[in-house]
Amino acid sequence: VPLSRTVRCTCISISNQPVNPRSLEKLEIIPASQFCPRVEIIATMKKKGEKRCLNPESKAIKNLLKAVSKERSKRSP
């Protein structure tokens, strides 16, 4: 969906629900910028490619980010 000039943030709602890292296809962290003054986290799920906005302040999401970064550091040489 193309964004209008005034709407640059992506997330309309944000989820506090825990996400199973195994169900994740991709996790995008979009830093705050001149276009959107807040960090946005978008999870792409393996199921039907659903994209879900996550709450960066949620404990469950912070734990998910830790788990994902741990997994990445294991994989990197």
Partner: antibody, heavy 124, light 109 residues
């Protein structure tokens, strides 16, 4: 339980203003986008406006642009619709509705919770 | 602006029968952006389907959604007495803008 309760409807003359409120309870209001949707007597649903969870995203139907303003107060768990320059064609039941959990400009989870509506009648 | 057309306008069926409701868009719509709602007289709408085919929480599995591009379908496999209502499809587009179809009324034959 999860609930949305609209208030502020009534009979108003053309050209006048009215402010609708929607009180939310039973969920974390501050993480959900919110909508106003209306339904004229005997007609279908018409989307009016949306506001993102933090108020940064706002959008309006062409039919109300420049006349209606959507806003929210997350500290009061309340959504508002300020309606100015009202016309006879604005007569309808106005519903507030919650945007689904985690909706973004890339994936839409639908309006998953609705209030029972408040009636606005614009008549001289 | 994308326009949604629903057909038929009214569907007269008996309990136990299968209902097939159509929603056609004037331009291609991503299935990620299509939802279906049910509305009974004097009540608020209820979300049935999002993402064209995912059932909302608490929706019975007799309701299913399908389709892509410009043609989408809501199927009720076996009509129960409580399913007689008006059904709306809805599309989410740029800006963001949310558009409803005109509705299909499912009534008792």
């Amino acid at each position: 339980q999860v609930q949305l309760v609209e208030s502020g409807g009534g009979v108003v003359q053309p050209g006048r203003s009215l402010r609708l409120s929607c009180a939310a309870s039973g969920f974390t209001f501050s993480t959900h986008g919110m909508h106003w949707v209306r339904q004229a007597p005997g007609k279908g649903l018409e989307w009016v406006a949306v506001i993102g969870f933090g108020g940064l995203i706002k959008s309006y139907a062409d039919s109300v642009k420049g006349r209606f303003t959507i806003s929210r107060d997350n500290s009061k768990n309340t959504l508002y619709l300020q309606m100015n320059s009202l016309r006879a064609e604005d007569t309808a039941v106005y519903y507030c509705a919650r945007e689904g959990d985690g909706s973004s400009l890339y994936f839409y989870y639908g309006m998953d919770v609705w209030g029972q509506g408040t009636t606005v009648t614009v008549s001289s | 602006e994308i326009v949604l057309t629903q057909s038929p306008g009214t569907l007269s069926l008996s309990p136990g029968e299968r209902a097939t409701l159509s929603c056609r868009a004037s331009q291609s719509v991503s299935s990620s952006y299509l939802a279906w709602y049910q509305q009974k007289p004097g009540q608020a709408p209820r979300l049935l389907i999002y993402g064209a085919s995912s059932r909302a929480t608490g929706i019975p599995d007799r309701f299913s959604g399908s389709g892509s591009g410009t043609d989408f379908t809501l199927t009720i496999s076996r009509l129960e007495p409580e399913d007689f209502a008006v059904y709306y499809c809805q599309q989410y587009g740029s800006s963001p803008i949310f558009t409803f179809g005109p509705g299909t009324k499912v009534d008792i034959k």
